[in-house]
């Protein structure tokens, strides 16, 4: 093996020189750094426009961050022989705007995938399942990181972004083994109803820094393994009884609710009662009212029923213009 592609203890990462020779099984692609000892290839901030074809077979951790990939086609990582060891793939910040169906096919060991910070105008429903069958082969993915993948408004498709992401998560029930899902900073206004039902193995769910106003139609009931639920920095006004009961029924969960604009009126009474007795919410004494104005900054835990009133709704005949 040439010195440009072999690795030694004195130089654990070697930048590759472009070579006219046919690719060797353990060659390091141009514009990448490779360490066979660490089973790692880094092609970072190199303005790559496509995935290198000549990735070494030993690669277990592949970093393709900070590039200009634009489109990830079907079989983007399919090789002969396959990259059978590849377990962690980081594509964050690579200007991807389209991930097509089957993009991650033929990666039998892929456990962690990070697509964060890519403006995904199009995410195929079959991006993770690889096929359009109603039940596909289970994906090996255990961790899926999709933070800040929302495209700018002018690049959005007609359909809802929430719906597009949800379709990819539930297609073929391929992600039933997923333990970690990060969906932070995506401007989600709602969480499609059926998504969580298809992800029964989740242990960690991050929905922070979205625009979720309500969880009324979201069911957490079957997430019996859930350990962390991050709902900080959303637009939540109140959690209703159904949601409270579901969260209380999850045996291991810790819920994070900081920085939401809680509305402290009569509809908040059940949530306040629940907060006072639950051990589920982390940092619950940091939760404060945002509305109405007279209640701003009041600590939820310190409220009682007398504090939580609603202005009476006048019958139309008594309303003044």
């Amino acid at each position: 093996t040439s010195s440009a592609s072999s690795s030694s203890s004195s130089a654990p990462f070697l930048a590759s020189a472009a070579s006219a020779q046919p690719p060797l099984p353990d060659q390091c692609p141009a514009l990448c750094e490779c360490s066979e000892a660490a089973r790692t290839v880094k092609c970072v901030n190199r303005n790559l426009t496509e995935v290198p074809t000549d990735l070494p077979l030993y690669v277990r951790n592949l970093f393709l961050t900070g590039n200009q990939l634009a489109v990830l086609p079907a079989g983007a990582f399919a090789r002969r022989p396959p990259l059978a060891e590849l377990a962690a793939l980081n594509l964050s910040g690579s200007r991807l705007d389209e991930v097509r169906g089957g993009a991650f096919e033929h990666l039998p060991s892929l456990r962690q995938l990070d697509l964060s910070h890519n403006p995904l105008a199009y995410l195929s429903p079959f991006a993770f399942s690889g096929s359009n069958a109603s039940i596909s082969a289970p994906s090996p993915l255990v961790e899926l990181i999709l933070n800040h993948i929302v495209p700018p408004d002018d690049k959005r498709q007609n359909r809802s972004f929430e719906g597009m992401v949800a379709a990819a998560l539930v297609a073929g029930r391929a992600l039933q083994g997923l333990h970690l899902l990060e969906l932070a900073s995506n401007h989600f206004l709602y969480l499609p109803r059926d998504v969580l039902a298809q992800l029964p193995s989740l242990r960690y769910l991050d929905l922070s820094n979205n625009s979720l106003v309500s969880l009324t139609y979201v069911s957490f009931r079957n997430l019996t393994h859930l350990e962390s639920l991050h709902l900080e920095d959303n637009a939540l006004k109140v959690l209703h009884n159904g949601t409270l009961a579901e969260l209380q029924g999850l045996p291991h969960v810790r819920v994070f609710l900081d920085n939401n604009p809680w509305v402290c009126d009569c509809h908040m009474a059940d949530m306040v009662t629940w907060l006072k007795q639950t051990g589920v919410v982390q940092g619950k004494d940091r939760l404060t009212c945002a509305f109405p104005e007279k209640m701003r900054n009041r600590v939820l835990l310190e409220l009682n029923s007398a504090d939580l009133d609603c202005d009476p709704i006048l019958p139309p005949s008594l309303q003044t213009s």
Epitope: N209, D233, N259, D285, R286, T288, A290, R296, N297, R298, V299, L301, E302, L303
Partner: antibody, heavy 116, light 107 residues
Amino acid sequence: QVQLQQSGAELMKPGASVKLSCKATGYTFTGYWIEWVKQRPGQGLEWIGETLPGRGSTNYNEKFKGKATFTADTSSNIVYMQLSSLTIEDSAIYYCARGRRDFDYWGQGTTLTVSS
Amino acid sequence: DIQMTQTTSSLSASLGDEVTISCSASQGINNYLNWYQQKPDGTVKLLIYYTSSLHSGVPSRFSGSGSGTDYSLTIINLEPEDIATYYCQQFSKLPFTFGSGTKLEIR
């Protein structure tokens, strides 16, 4: 109306400790966080930390851990900040304010001078 | 920690003028930004909370705007009592941090 009344100016020697107070009136004392803010002469504002009087909960700026300690007396609606092992750098005006997402009412400040 | 930067440390304007004071954060803070006024005698008051909401009792001559990392406070029809130092503050993440202040003087 909401008022935060702070204790008077203090002149202390290096190495000593001092306890500043902030008396709250005009609102439900245990229902709001109290914030503490430092301002060195001619400088800007620096957040020290916060306390929730009814529960004893505290959050400190890492920079002030070991320097500042918050306590409260809920029977008299007073929050205290103790500053220990005083140095010249602790000379400042210290403000208390009602928090948390915004500091909507402020005390008038307590001037602490540390001098040998 | 999130750094808050007020690039203009002092500003001179005439009575009746419109003045804009800017503030930038080292990372996005989701509109979690407040503005405070400190008078020469040391008195501190909240003016604007959550980027653009006017605190009760504050004249409507004051307004706030911004998003992401960039925010501003605007005062129209400047009056003598507006002579003060103005501070921005983020409450997105602990520790809460303030800008270095912008001192407003009357020309």
